[in-house]
């Protein structure tokens, strides 16, 4: 509801506005009600971030946001007597939080993470421009199912990139994937400016490759049956089936959005299995098939990360060259 009467005079400002950080990237502002507010006013609080984004009118005396603390962020808060956005709130009080100190050129860049097969997360980053080449990095991570911030132990080097991987298994809790993983990278010596990232669990998901179970010919059609990677249901995946013919040296790629095993030629009721029929394939030549998968937007925000290709499987016979 809209609360009680809305006196015409402006309410006093909120008091004791303070800001703190929880976990790695959860910023929380709290405040106290204004002193000397009208007795017939049902207090609501108007707040928005410094760039006038995310306006909110709510009765709670706190507001939080999950944000990578790579830049200064400010919240302005005012009080008012109704939920009406057109009502002029009190004088707005502002409280800002700045990122940790340090030379911005020393902070790591290109910090990104990929959730591999919904079982482990692999993050990688580039050293900052003003960083000694022998800098030792540490990655910290936190997500909702952890009680405290964890330090990633498996630091590796891959070309010019540093990285670290940690276990992150999809839990049955249906809301798990609606959350994010909070990441921070800094150096052991405390010389570089820390870098933060927030990885939504519905993006940057890379499935394992599928496993081809069976290839068979029926007339001039090639029936392909494969097992999807663990942890994924078939309706959440798109597929690419590549068929190479040794005789004609043709290379056909089929983009498959639905891969149901409804045709009688396919083995039925096999858990987590998908199927596709490749039309017009010559049975008396050698055909080599491989498949890759990616998440789709039915279940995930991101649909750009293909799995690696499956192992190849061949069917037919190689013709002797004459």
């Amino acid at each position: 509801g809209g609360g009680g009467a809305a006196p015409t005079e402006t309410q006093p400002p909120v008091t004791n506005l303070s800001v703190s950080v929880e976990n790695l990237c959860t910023v929380i502002w709290t405040w106290n009600p204004p002193e000397g507010a009208s007795s017939n006013c049902s207090l609501w609080y108007f707040s928005h971030f410094g760039d006038k984004q995310d306006k909110k009118i709510a009765p709670e005396t706190r507001r939080s946001i999950e944000v990578p603390l790579n830049e200064r962020i400010c919240l302005q808060v005012g009080s008012q007597c109704s939920t009406n956005e057109s009502e002029k709130p009190s004088i707005l009080v502002e409280k800002c939080i700045s990122p940790p100190e340090g030379d911005p050129e020393s902070a790591v860049t290109e910090l990104q993470c990929i959730w591999h097969n919904l079982s482990y997360m692999k993050c990688s980053w580039l050293p900052g421009r003003n960083t000694s080449p022998d800098t030792n990095y540490t990655l910290y991570y936190w997500h909702r199912s952890l009680e405290k911030i964890h330090q990633c132990e498996n630091i590796f080097r891959e070309g010019q990139y540093f990285g670290c991987s940690f276990d992150l298994t999809k839990v049955k809790d249906s809301s798990f994937e609606q959350h994010s993983v909070q990441i921070m990278v800094k150096d052991n010596a405390g010389k570089i400016k820390p870098s933060f990232n927030i990885v939504p669990l519905t993006s940057r998901v890379k499935p394992d490759p599928p496993h081809i179970k069976n290839l068979s010919f029926h007339n001039d059609d090639l029936y392909v049956q494969w097992e999807n990677p663990q942890n994924f249901i078939s309706r959440c995946l798109f597929y690419e089936v590549e068929v190479n013919n040794s005789q004609t040296e043709t290379h056909n790629v089929f983009y498959v959005q639905e891969a149901k095993c409804e045709n009688p030629e396919f083995e039925r009721n096999v858990e987590n299995t998908s199927c596709f029929m490749v039309p017009g394939v010559l049975p008396d030549t050698l055909n080599t098939v491989r498949i890759r998968v990616k998440t789709n937007k039915l279940c995930y925000e991101d649909d750009k990360l293909w799995s690696n290709w499956s192992q190849e499987m061949s069917i037919g016979k190689k013709r002797n060259s004459t």
Epitope: N130, P133, E158, G159, Q160, Y161
Partner: antibody, heavy 119, light 107 residues
Framework: EVQLLESGGDLIQPGGSLRLSCAAS????????MNWVRQAPGKGLEWVSV????????YYADSVKGRFTISRDNSKNTLYLQMDSLRAEDTAVYYC????????????WGQGTLVTVSS | DIQMTQSPSSLSASVGDRVTITCRAS??????LAWYQQKPEKAPKSLIY???SLQSGVPSRFSGSGSGTDFTLTISSLQPEDFATYYC?????????FGQGTKVEIK
């Protein structure tokens, strides 16, 4: 075996544009920084530009900033240098060089391609 | 920018000689220095990185030393194929800079 093969060098008039390419093979292209280094006739080496493995981060020498653009196509294992507003002093052999890691030395070099800016 | 100064600019030596080239940085660069060899009409070749680490495949007669501002490349026993121009390069801070080169000629 690591191989870097530059192409695209030519004789060009001042103010003109040119695009150099560098085809890479023999290593995992998308995890290494790639550089352009040039050498004017009879002179020493001058670093021109670098691009990170994913192609997100780029840096330039002051002498080419705003005129040259470095880019890469990781699907083709190819590095590029787009050169605009060319000047006589850009005349040089342009080498592409693989970074051994990020802010580091160059462990492999191409054979170079000659760019001549003259009217 | 960090200036790199090599000395000498050129030198004449005989096969079997011990040759030393120095490189001085205008400010401290820790050990972040590389050495390259370049033969006429050829691309440079990496010899040494991190001041003293030998690039794989480079003969052990090449060695590097130094840290901070003063660095040395030493060829313990000069071979016919070593006649070339040698460059140092700092990678402590952007932009990367090279020395002007030292030409090693046959006496």
């Amino acid at each position: 075996e690591v191989q870097l093969l530059e192409s695209g060098g030519d004789l060009i008039q001042p103010g003109g544009s040119l695009r150099l390419s560098c085809a890479a093979s023999g290593f995992t292209f998308n995890i290494y920084a790639m550089n352009w280094v040039r050498q004017a006739p009879g002179k020493g080496l001058e670093w021109v530009s670098v691009i990170s493995g994913r192609g997100i981060t780029t840096y330039y020498a002051d002498s080419v900033k705003g005129r040259f653009t470095i880019s890469r196509d990781n699907s083709k294992n190819t590095l590029y240098l787009q050169m605009d507003s060319l000047r006589a002093e850009d005349t040089a052999v342009y080498y592409c060089a693989k970074g051994s890691s990020y802010w580091t030395d160059f462990d492999y070099w191409g054979q170079g391609t000659l760019v001549t800016v003259s009217s | 920018d960090i200036q790199m100064t090599q000395s000498p600019s050129s030198l004449s030596a005989s096969v079997g000689d011990r040759v030393t080239i120095t490189c001085r940085a205008s400010q401290g660069i820790s050990s972040w220095l590389a050495w390259y060899q370049q033969k006429p009409e050829k691309a440079p070749k990496s010899l040494i990185y991190a001041a003293s680490s030998l690039q794989s495949g480079v003969p052990s007669r090449f060695s590097g030393s130094g840290s901070g501002t003063d660095f040395t490349l030493t060829i313990s026993s000069l071979q016919p194929e070593d006649f070339a121009t040698y460059y140092c390069q700092q990678y402590n801070s952007y932009p990367w800079t090279f020395g002007q080169g030292t030409k090693v000629e046959i006496k």
